[in-house]
Amino acid sequence: IWELKKDVYVVELDWYPDAPGEMVVLTCDTPEEDGITWTLDQSSEVLGSGKTLTIQVKEFGDAGQYTCHKGGEVLSHSLLLLHKKEDGIWSTDILKDQKEPKNKTFLRCEAKNYSGRFTCWWLTTISTDLTFSVKSSRGSSDPQGVTCGAATLSAERVRGDNKEYEYSVECQEDSACPAAEESLPIEVMVDAVHKLKYENYTSSFFIRDIIKPDPPKNLQLKPLKNSRQVEVSWEYPDTWSTPHSYFSLTFCVQVQGKSKREKKDRVFTDKTSATVICRKNASISVRAQDRYYSSSWSEWASVPCS
Amino acid sequence: RNLPVATPDPGMFPCLHHSQNLLRAVSNMLQKARQTLEFYPCTSEEIDHEDITKDKTSTVEACLPLELTKNESCLNSRETSFITNGSCLASRKTSFMMALCLSSIYEDLKMYQVEFKTMNAKLLMDPKRQIFLDQNMLAVIDELMQALNFNSETVPQKSSLEEPDFYKTKIKLCILLHAFRIRAVTIDRVMSYLNAS
């Protein structure tokens, strides 16, 4: 058993039928010695008396809010949560496996630049009685500070018969140098509590590997005289690290016809303009990627050819 | 990106072209190592990230763009001094910091060159003959060093009398390649920045 936060405790259980469970001793936080009784949740049934209560925790029915009273007055509470170990592996019932970029990806994180600021998100089908707490650090043995905000519900989607809820959190490394070469990964730890079930999820990454620039901005077309060609121009996104001559991007320019089946013409360039043939009803799209370290491409910025 | 790329002419700054070749070569070598050594811990998640130049050179600090010198977190200054002449500085007014930066890059390349050559000698003794260093990568390191053209004491190639542990050597190769790729990215950024200045 260990303390998650004040008056909230996590009991780790090897989850199998007829398991002996864990013996837990609760102590009432009071100077009183006599006349103390214990109850669980909203029940008025007295579970025991005295300053301590010894219980055998085997299943969810044994978890919950234990309260010690004296003469009708509440003295203190202890909330017991369960963390299930299923055949040697901690349960992952609360969050959905996003399966991207690989199986067992419960937390996904992205950064728009090298400032040390990043966003992580996760998915669940659970809509109520759900709380998250996020901690982060650079490295684990001698951790350096990363500050995370509160996790918030950022999107709701309908997936088949189920509703899916997306939660996200923003974190910022306390003293980040955009030009630094990372040798210790960022560690992100999410504590998830659903009713009386506790689970924890972790992700470890280098900022350089989770970079995804915003799409190029100010995408414009300039027709060239007496030609089907147009000059496409764009700018670096505002959120990208500066100076741009140091943090350079490379770009992919795509001409896409109205039909998805039509052949796509693609050009790659390090410049912020390109000359392409604009077909009728086609659209021109541009996306960006770090020029020197191939992490993710940005989403496309698009304009119609007409 | 194995697709056609319209790259700008390196123009006045001869080192930019070499640094781009260097990054391409080390990235290819790392990819080859990850594929060939698939049963070894060779991915970014699995290896220990070590920097053989730590406390010996200060490339990141010495080559910091002016715009980032206001960032306190970037000014983790380390006392270092380097010889300051080099042909990449040709026909350019350069500050002491720029010379320091380029000589730091030269020292990095020299240290990696020695490590890679020592390692290759060991890998050539492996009866499995599983992996060797790409001669192109070693040649590109050499070309960039020549372009930088700093006078520097030659570092003798390390020789080892004991029987090499090929498993450890291959893991060390992965560690070195990951670190060198990160340094090659920094070098490319620096050359691009200097070229634009």
Partner: antibody, heavy 115, light 112 residues
Amino acid sequence: QVQLVESGGGVVQPGRSLRLSCAASGFTFSSYGMHWVRQAPGKGLEWVAFIRYDGSNKYYADSVKGRFTISRDNSKNTLYLQMNSLRAEDTAVYYCKTHTSHDNWGQGTMVTVSS
Amino acid sequence: QSVLTQPPSVSGAPGQRVTISCSGSRSNIGSNTVKWYQQLPGTAPKLLIYYNDQRPSGVPDRFSGSKSGTSASLAITGLQAEDEADYYCQSYDRYTHPALLFGTGTKVTVLA
């Protein structure tokens, strides 16, 4: 006393279907994930499918994906394996088993796919 | 095909010590715990070892398990006639969990 009893096996022609059941007793069935494992005659053990305690997630071996469906009815304390488009290579003893460290297995039910 | 490799057979005289190896990789045995099962002819597998080296109650202490890196082993000391059976190791892969990974199986023969 934890008990798992499989049923529904038999002889079936290739391309036909069969539904196996696994009746659980002596424990809180709805609290545990469950597996189906099979063993072809004279061969080793092969994992077939898994279902979460609440039925929310299902996983399958590549060899049965798209043909077999695992399901459970927690009100009946029963695990099921719906087997469609059966092939000769599906011939095996099928076991159900709890997803726990101290696991419990059923006695198995024989499925023979033969023309 | 199984990704956990076991020797097809091992044998020993009564009273002897035999060991069965189970070889995997970093993503399975290297990252997860190992179980061992005994299967007598015509019966369901019986759990011998869980969490690499733990014996459920009722399993004789002649059976012991261990794990090191990407491989595990089962040792049977004081071999007895009733130990003649098939033995399987089992683990998970960190990327395909909860799919069960079984070893190829080892036939233990007790020499007369």
